[in-house]
């Protein structure tokens, strides 16, 4: 009689993570008597995947009634496949004895596992940066297989070209990770901008995964200051305004100085938002010029988002204004941005 052959018809099988893998195996004879076992890998370190008669293999079921005496189909199904299951599986016939001895092995079936990449996570710099500066964004995605993957960067829909990407590990692995770093030059208009990392993989069926970062969390647009003297509101009173324009984020503190002395400090609250996402704010002082003999140097000093203060000054000429007699008390309009100085 012809010697028993162990036939594994599939050289390779590819399965999506979470699905079941069917590994086919048939033998051509019932002789010699002895069990079939399935192993992953070859040699002394091979891993037992299924033993017909004993052991605990909760994920493995036989495709046919392999326990029937005349059965020659020893195909198995492995449930809930993960990337860790990848490898070459061998169907091995044993000859019964003391102990059982390996009689013949199939040629092996290579199981590859298609695993989706995790949602890309995009992270930006730890500290805010100002326009014209170049900042780095990183994108990471893990757990995918096979290794081939495509990663693209976009800023507001425009593809970026200045980036570096690594897929790890370099050699064979059950699953892989991708890490990419993109360089982005900030502009004053970037408060509403988004940086997008897009990952395409065979498991995603043409529907790439995206991770985003809002540049509003990265950018700092410093304010421009303008101090102007408004027309006289009443006799001997001058309205001086400080226009704080185009700043982001909103965190801002303004201090008025008169001849170098602190007059008032306030925090930006009721700001107006520009179309580009930056903010404007205005503060003003009412100055009673009759209280001053000499010219007054008014300074608007702004500390924005914890940065060193910037300031703009305005020289208020008082020589042209006749002094009002007997006015030497100070009054403050609380709850507004006004300050009367006598």
């Amino acid at each position: 009689e012809e010697e028993l052959q162990v036939i594994q018809p599939d050289k390779s099988v590819s399965v999506a993570a979470g699905e079941s893998a069917i590994l086919h195996c048939t033998v051509t004879s019932l002789i010699p008597v002895g069990p079939i076992q399935w192993f992953r890998g070859a040699g002394p370190a091979r891993e037992l995947i299924y033993n017909q008669k004993e052991g605990h293999f909760p994920r493995v079921t036989t495709v046919s009634e392999s326990t029937k005496r005349e059965n020659m189909d020893f195909s198995i199904s492995i449930s809930n496949i993960t990337p860790a299951d990848a490898g070459t599986y061998y169907c091995v016939k044993f000859r019964k004895g003391s102990p059982d001895t390996e009689f013949k092995s199939g040629a092996g079936t290579e199981l590859s596992v298609r695993a989706k990449p995790s949602a890309p996570v995009v992270s930006g710099p730890a500290a805010r940066a100002t326009p014209q500066h170049t900042v780095s964004f990183t994108c990471e995605s893990h757990g995918f297989s096979p290794r081939d993957i495509t990663l693209k960067w976009f800023k507001n829909g425009n593809e970026l070209s200045d980036f570096q990407t690594n897929v790890d590990p370099v050699g064979e692995s059950v699953s892989y990770s991708i890490h990419s770093t993109a360089k982005v030059v900030l502009t004053r208009e970037d408060v509403h901008s988004q940086v997008i990392c897009e990952v395409a993989h065979v498991t995603l069926q043409g529907d790439p995964l995206r991770g985003t970062a809002n540049l509003s969390e990265t950018i700092r647009v410093p304010p421009t200051l303008e101090v102007t003297q408004q027309p006289v509101r009443a006799e001997n009173q001058v309205n001086v305004t400080c226009q704080v324009r185009k700043f982001y984020p909103q965190r801002l503190q303004l201090t008025w100085l008169e001849n170098g002395n602190v007059s008032r400090t306030e925090t930006a609250s009721t700001v107006t938002e520009n179309k580009d996402g930056t903010y404007n704010w205005m503060s003003w002082l009412l100055v009673n010029v009759s209280a001053h003999r000499d010219d007054v140097k008014l300074t608007c000093q702004v500390e924005h988002d914890g940065q060193p203060a910037v300031s703009k000054s305005h020289d208020l000429k008082v020589s042209a204004h006749p002094k009002e007699q007997g006015s030497n008390t100070a009054a403050e309009n609380t709850g507004s941005n006004e300050r009367n100085i006598y």
Partner: antibody, heavy 113, light 108 residues
Framework: EVQLVQSGAEVKKPGATVKISCKAS????????MHWVQQAPGKGLEWIGR????????KYAPKFQGRVTITADTSTNTAYMELSSLRSEDTAVYYC??????WGQGTLVTVSS | EIVLTQSPATLSLSPGERATLSCSAS???????LYWYQQKPGQAPKLWIY???NLASGIPARFSGSGSGTDYTLTISSLEPEDFAVYYC?????????FGQGTKLEIK
């Protein structure tokens, strides 16, 4: 549901023979090796042997070889373990198990004169 | 015959502590054939960990198994009151199959 129900406790005299049964349900014993394990009072587990009910092939631990006989009746889906020439040190709980994963509740055998 | 030696014989710990149980084989055992069982007084052993590191159905994730060759370990990351029992390692790599003598995990 896999279940292994063993026969009740036995009291035997030294030199006698005891035969314990293990009735299986929820599976066909022909499909699995059936093992027997001994546990003396306050002691650990000791593997006695196993049977392949499909062809009645057996394997025994050297310690029990010659005194133990494991059999199976596939028509009643039952495995048996017979231990002869009993001595006091054979006083123990005896467990059957299916393929190392599912265990019977145990049978206490007391050997006493 | 492969002799399995478990250490320590008794381990006294408090709930919340980490437990490490060792099983040393007199000759190499393939990791596929190394199992752990838990046994409580008056009960049959229960399969706890199979193929060195796989938890049997319903076993909490605080349990883990590791090892290869001749040295194997069962670890409980944070002991719960129900974990106090006797644990046996078992090899079925070659006949005769053997068990370790057991480690009794008791409440301190």
């Amino acid at each position: 549901e896999v279940q292994l129900v063993q026969s009740g406790a036995e009291v035997k005299k030294p030199g006698a023979t005891v035969k314990i049964s293990c009735k299986a349900s929820g599976f066909n014993i022909k499909d699995y090796y059936m093992h027997w394990v001994q546990q003396a009072p306050g002691k650990g587990l000791e593997w006695i042997g196993r049977i392949d009910p499909e062809d009645a092939e057996t394997k025994y631990a050297p310690k029990f070889q010659g005194r133990v006989t494991i059999t199976a009746d596939t028509s009643t889906n039952t495995a048996y373990m017979e231990l002869s020439s009993l001595r006091s040190e054979d006083t123990a709980v005896y467990y059957c198990d299916r393929g190392l994963a599912y265990w019977g509740q145990g049978t206490l055998v007391t050997v006493s004169s | 015959e492969i002799v399995l030696t478990q250490s320590p014989a008794t381990l006294s710990l408090s709930p919340g502590e980490r437990a490490t149980l060792s099983c040393s084989a007199s000759s190499s055992v393939s990791s596929s054939y190394l199992y752990w069982y838990q046994q409580k007084p008056g009960q049959a052993p229960k399969l706890w960990i199979y193929s060195t590191s796989n938890l049997a159905s319903g076993i909490p994730a605080r349990f883990s198994g590791s090892g290869s060759g001749t040295d194997y370990t069962l670890t409980i990351s944070s002991l719960e009151p129900e974990d106090f029992a006797v644990y046996y390692c078992h090899q079925w790599s070659s006949y005769p199959y053997t068990f370790g003598q057991g480690t009794k995990l008791e409440i301190k």
